[in-house]
């Protein structure tokens, strides 16, 4: 009984043409869908002049339908039992399932001001980038439409730069008709204990983001993870979107739709400072900002983002420590809204259902020489937008589930 | 093809004044900003005003302050450095360069300013 | 302001030695120093910026290296038309600054 359910999940599980888990590898059966909550920010004049603290009011969600295009390119490798592809990104604005059009206009921090005064930090330079803010009308703050701040539009202050320099800013410019990867995952017919677990991205096993073993990429995509998953396990996967290997942990049993899954959980360990966690003093990449490696539950992922001081956490702050979230006025962080969780069909290691929630944040630093920055007193880690990426199996997926390998096992 | 033209350099006794153009083509010279440098005879560069893009701000070297003044006219697309209670040590060629993230791409030929009795 | 020392203030060299020219800078300037060649009676032209990035159209010959007070121009065969005077500068902060010059002559 047993050692022939576990040969035929060992069989079904490898990622090879014929498969059940290959189908639904190649192009997900789920339908994802990624809320957005924009942080529209209430107070832009009394920051900018007073260095007030900012007073933000959530608004969303704004959900596009995700993870619809199959994998491109995937190609075998029969010699090292590896698949390797590239994962299509693609957005589809759903509006029955949105409090608004992409049209919809937000007071937000600006983008390309806040990324060029951090980035060109010497003097001269500022003097330069005042001149540009001051001539194409910019400030601190901006307004634009949710269309605008996720997917891109011209800056009017890098387009006066007189030489080639790259003038769309967006969140997430580009998105549409590009590709993550390339990924190269063990397809687990040589050692089913290894399958989706990710050998090379982009042709590395190591980021260059980070040092020591926080540059490491480790496990597998969370789509899946090899079979036989037991409580005890902690679960490691790469996650592009925040530049880094995390890992989740066991929190409970959950019923979906008449399957035992376990819910593993992002623990707010992984997010603590090294004082707390010192498995994460390579995440501590400046002593400033993060108060010499002591502030915690954020990430700054600036050397992913070519310079940008883009600064990852969970939504609302939630695991933060206190001086992060002091500036800000208007979150609400809760674990039931605000955390990741995995729920994983422990027999095959498929992600059923899940929720990816992340918040992106920038930094805004003061500058003598840049007019709108003269007056703030204190840096800034400025909430911009919260998302939440969910998963669910289908009614009929889900049957089809229950009948082949669940109910099969009791 | 970028190039920039200075004029108006001659003899000047000292306390006098002089005004020195820079006529620059190939280029907007609003977009970058121009710089004035000058090299006494036999000496090394120094930087003398800057005007930033966009008739941005002028900044001066604290040996020419309150004494020189940089402007441009943009519809001539030339720059101008207004110079007033010259000194004999004021005495060099001067180059007005383009520049924008503060190193000089294209210089002018320079233009000898003599200031003696 | 920030000073930039250059050494040494001249040298003598063959056609094909290697040249080396130093520059100091009096604090940090992180990758924000130029380099010129100067003949006499004529305008500087630029060999290098963000210390290391050759100018579009200079030989290949011409390299720069350094970061933070560091600095150095490196001719790796000297020419017979390299015979000049060199400048670095920094443009990190106003006002920009030169160092005095290498006069680089014939041995």
């Known amino acids: 009984g047993d050692l022939l359910i576990q040969k035929t999940i060992k069989k079904q599980v490898v990622l090879e043409e014929g498969t059940i888990a290959f189908k639904n590898w190649v192009k997900t059966g789920t339908e994802v869908y990624r809320q957005f909550w924009i942080f529209d920010v209430q107070n832009p004049q009394e920051v900018m002049m007073n260095s007030s603290n900012i007073q933000v009011k959530q608004r969303g969600p704004y959900t596009y339908r995700v993870r619809f295009l199959a994998k491109e390119n995937v190609t075998q490798d029969a010699e090292d039992n590896t698949v390797s592809f590239l994962q299509p990104n693609g957005a589809i604005f759903e509006p029955s399932l949105s409090v608004g059009t992409e049209a919809d206009n937000f007071t937000v921090l600006n983008l390309a001001v806040a990324a060029a005064s951090h980035i060109y930090q010497n003097q001269f330079v500022q003097m330069i980038l005042n001149s540009l803010i001051n001539k194409s009308k910019s400030s601190m703050f901006q307004v634009r439409t949710l269309r605008e701040l996720l997917w891109g539009y011209r800056d009017p202050f890098l387009s006066l730069v007189p030489y080639p320099v790259t003038t769309t800013v967006g969140l997430f410019y580009p998105y549409n008709n590009t590709a993550d990867g390339v990924y190269k995952v063990f397809n687990g017919k040589d050692n089913i204990s290894k399958v989706a677990i990710i050998d090379t991205y982009k042709g590395k096993r190591n980021l260059s983001y980070w040092e020591s073993h926080c540059d490491m990429i480790n496990g597998t995509d969370a789509a899946s993870f090899p079979p036989f998953v037991e409580k005890s396990q902690v679960l490691q996967f790469f996650s592009s979107d925040i530049c880094r290997s995390i890992y989740a942990v066991f929190e409970s049993d959950v019923n979906l739709k008449g399957i035992p899954v376990y819910r593993f959980v992002l623990p707010s360990k992984a997010f603590a400072s090294p004082v707390e966690n010192p498995d994460n003093y390579c995440f501590c990449t400046e002593k400033i900002i993060s108060k010499n490696c002591t502030s915690y539950g954020v990430l700054d992922i600036s050397k992913c983002k070519e310079g940008r001081p883009v600064y990852i956490s969970l939504p609302h702050f939630l695991y933060a420590s206190p001086d992060v979230s002091e500036p800000i006025d208007g979150l609400n962080p809760n674990e039931e809204e605000h955390r990741t969780y995995l729920d994983i069909e422990p027999i095959t290691g498929f992600t059923l259902q899940f929720a990816k929630r992340l918040q992106v944040n920038l930094l805004v630093k003061p500058s003598e020489k840049i007019q709108v920055l003269k007056n703030l007193k204190r840096n800034y880690i400025v909430p911009i937008l919260w998302l939440n990426e969910t998963g669910t199996i289908g009614d009929e997926k889900a049957n089809m589930f229950r009948s082949q390998v669940t109910g099969k096992i009791n | 093809e970028v190039q920039l033209v200075e004029s108006g350099g001659g003899l000047v006794q000292p306390g006098g004044s002089l005004r020195l153009s820079c006529a620059a083509s190939?280029?907007?010279?609003?977009?970058?900003?121009i710089h004035w440098v000058r090299q006494a005879p036999g000496k090394g560069l120094e930087w003398v005003a800057w005007?930033?893009?966009?008739?941005?701000?002028?900044y001066y070297a604290d040996s020419v302050k309150g004494r020189f003044t940089i402007s441009a006219d943009t519809s001539k697309n030339t720059a101008y450095l207004q110079m007033n209670s010259l000194r004999a040590e004021d005495t060099a060629v001067y180059y007005c360069?383009?520049?924008?993230?503060?190193?000089?791409?294209?210089w002018g030929q320079g233009t000898l300013v003599t200031v003696s009795s | 302001d920030i000073q930039m020392t250059q050494s040494p203030s001249s040298l003598s060299a063959s056609v094909g030695d290697r040249v080396t020219i130093t520059c100091r800078a009096s604090?940090?300037?992180?990758?924000?120093v130029a380099w010129y060649q100067q003949k006499p009676g004529k305008a500087p032209k630029l060999l290098i910026s963000?210390?290391?990035s050759l100018y579009s159209g200079v030989p290949s010959r011409f390299s720069g290296s350094g970061s933070g007070t560091d600095f150095t121009l490196t001719i790796s065969s000297l020419q017979p038309e390299d015979f000049a005077t060199y400048y670095c500068?920094?443009?990190?902060?106003?006002?920009?600054?030169f160092g005095q010059g290498t006069k680089v002559e014939i041995k």
């Open positions: 190939g280029f907007t010279i609003s977009s970058f900003g």
């Open positions: 604090q940090d300037v992180s990758n924000w």
């Open positions: 360069a383009r520049s924008f993230f503060g190193y000089f791409d294209y």
């Open positions: 963000y210390a290391t």
């Open positions: 500068q920094q443009h990190s902060n106003a006002p920009l600054t």
């Open positions: 005007i930033a893009p966009y008739g941005g701000d002028e």
